[in-house]
């Protein structure tokens, strides 16, 4: 018996060939011997089966001895053994129809779980193997669960259902709602304007919700809300902003915030959350601000950084065009009685300069 696998909602063609390449009598029946379709004279006739309005045949191939049955808009309950009667012989074809669906919205927040459920005919014992856009392989039976979706899981998932050495492939588009980056750090000299950007890793026709940036300044004992905003059809409007600092926000996506001045008291880390309408949970992006200040006071030249820096970062004071350098894996470096000239304060990570500030030391007479 030939086995054919079909997909729910798709069209399947069950083939039946006569030995002689000519038009002849044929019938398709189901396992209960109820006629589905056949030929009477030169015309296609349909029986009283439930398939009658969805079953058809390729009339153009009849004179070549091909008497296939096409079933449109397949349903799980169409799974059955179908019998083709032609030239006093019977050909049996077992049709197994499967459906694979995400049993929740296919637009999911990062960290949420995705469950794919296989609909299958009674008596079947299929296996399912799914491959994520990032190449992750997951296997299962009637259900496949991906517990913690990551942003790289966005895209088309390809799932293969196997039964009796036959396979059928499903493609499911999953959109993981997340920011492009989980975390970002902005390095600025004191007084410079700061730009924070929060690009999304997805696009939606309508994007509505609300967001907030909570900020924990390094020098403050507690965090506070810097800005609360509204998002309506990709248009951004500020609902509430703290007085100090007075952030500005772009009116269009990507979400864009401007801090007029980088000051030591603002250095720290923030958490931008975005709650989307009709979605449970929130999108998060962490943002850090590191501020550098170089100062000369009497005989002391000091360079300091504030904000979340890793212990492996190096802070250096260096006299331009001279070898004089002081370097530390610390948040402050200083030189007593510095030589006159242009000094550079550098914050670097394994030789890569993240932030630099110049300060001119004038000779003292």
């Amino acid at each position: 018996k030939k086995v054919v696998l079909g997909k729910k909602g798709d069209t399947v063609e069950l083939t039946c060939n006569a030995s002689q390449k000519k038009n002849t009598q044929f019938h398709w029946k189901n396992s209960n011997q109820i006629k589905i379709l056949g030929i009477q004279g030169l015309f296609l006739t349909k029986g009283p089966s439930k398939l009658s309005d969805r079953a058809d045949s390729r009339k153009s191939l009849w004179d070549q001895g091909c008497f296939s049955m096409i079933i449109k808009n397949l349903k799980i309950e169409d799974s059955d053994t179908y019998i083709c009667e032609v030239e006093n012989k019977k050909e049996e074809v077992e049709l197994l129809v499967f459906g694979l669906t995400a049993n929740s919205d296919t637009h999911l927040l990062e960290g949420q779980s995705l469950t794919l459920t296989l609909e299958s005919p009674p008596g079947s014992s299929p296996s399912v193997k799914c491959r994520s856009p990032g190449g992750k392989n997951i296997q299962g039976g009637r259900t496949i669960s991906v517990p913690q979706l990551e942003r790289q899981d966005s895209g088309t998932w390809t799932c293969t259902v196997s039964q009796d050495q036959k396979t059928v492939e499903f493609k499911i588009d999953i959109v993981v709602l997340a920011f492009q980056k989980a975390s970002s750090t902005v390095y600025k000299k004191e007084g410079e304007q700061v730009e924070f950007s929060f690009p999304l890793a997805f696009t939606l026709e309508k994007l509505t919700g609300s967001g907030e940036l909570w900020w924990q300044a390094e020098r403050a004992s507690s965090s506070k809300s810097w800005i609360t905003f509204d998002l309506k059809n990709k248009e951004v409007s500020v609902k509430r902003v703290t007085q100090d600092p007075k952030l500005q926000m772009g009116k269009k996506l990507p979400l864009h915030l401007t801090l007029p001045q980088a000051l030591p008291q603002y250095a720290g880390s923030g958490n931008l959350t975005l709650a989307l309408e009709a979605k449970t949970g929130k999108l998060h992006q962490e943002v850090n601000l590191v501020v550098m200040r170089a100062t000369q006071f009497q005989e002391n030249l000091t360079c300091e950084v504030w904000g979340p820096t890793s212990p492996k970062l190096t802070l250096s004071l260096k006299l331009e065009n001279k070898g004089a350098t002081v370097s530390k894996q610390a948040k402050a470096v200083w030189v007593l009685n510095p030589e006159a000239g242009m000094w550079q304060c550098l914050l670097s990570d394994s030789g890569q300069v993240l932030l630099e500030s110049n300060i001119k030391v004038v000779p003292t007479w």
Epitope: T208, G209, S210, G211, E212, S221, S222, S223, K224, S225, T228, D230, K232, K239, R240, T242, Q243, D244, T273, A275, E277, A278, T280
Partner: antibody, heavy 119, light 107 residues
């Protein structure tokens, strides 16, 4: 544990004044907007006023504008509502409430203090 | 000012019933809507903010839906402790306004 405790309510004659206080604990008071909401006996809730984290921004319902003043003292974790030119229709239980999170909802409420305006 | 109209003003229901309370805003408020529960002699308790975000610790039988001007609070299977008055409140623009309340009573 977040706690809000109101005080200062009482019986006052029409045209009189009262000062309501709300003592906050269990959270960083200076990081939150705060509101006053009142409820007349047997009636529904009515939002009265709110104030931002540092006290520089205040909003009021029209019926109390020019008569009520909201203020805060972050050093003392205290919220106040000064009630002047009181009317009979100001009789209510006055609750202070914290505004929490990005949807600006009132996530913690005090038990309230009763203000009765009657001659 | 934005008017908030709740319906019904009271509803009689039995334990296990599904209860829907609707709230209509006189102008669009997007999702800036909260639902509160108040029991006699008690302080109001926040159930839902952002029209549909359940507050932590609130049972999952409570759910909120809607956007713009029409909102619904649903209690999927009423429990004895759910008999109370429910208020909606808009935080879209000042002055913030509450609905007049819906009392859920025992049938």
């Amino acid at each position: 544990e977040v706690q809000l405790v109101e005080s200062g309510g009482g019986l006052v004659q029409p045209g009189g004044s009262l000062r309501l206080s709300c003592a906050a604990s269990g959270f960083t008071f200076s990081s939150y907007w705060m509101s006053w909401v009142r409820q007349a006996p047997g009636k529904g809730l009515e939002w009265v006023a709110n104030i931002n984290e540092d006290g520089s921004e205040k909003n009021y319902v029209d019926s109390v504008k020019g008569r009520f003043t909201i203020s805060r003292d972050n050093a003392k974790n205290s919220l106040c509502l000064q009630l002047n030119s009181l009317r009979a229709e100001d009789t209510a239980v006055y609750h202070c409430a914290r505004e929490g999170g990005q949807w600006l909802a009132l996530d913690y409420w005090g038990q309230g203090t009763l203000v009765t305006v009657s001659s | 000012d934005i008017q908030m109209t709740q319906s019904p003003s009271s509803v009689s229901a039995s334990v296990g019933d599904r209860v829907n309370i609707t709230c209509r805003a006189s102008q669009g408020i997007r999702s800036w809507l909260a639902w509160y529960q108040q029991k006699p002699g008690k302080t109001p308790k926040l159930l839902i903010c952002g029209a549909s975000s359940l507050q932590s610790g609130v049972p999952s039988r409570f759910s909120g839906s809607g956007s713009g001007t029409d909102f619904t609070l649903t209690i999927s299977s009423l429990q004895p402790e759910d008999f109370a008055t429910y208020y909606c409140q808009q935080a879209n623009s000042f002055p913030w306004t509450f609905g007049q309340g819906t009392t859920v009573e025992i049938k």
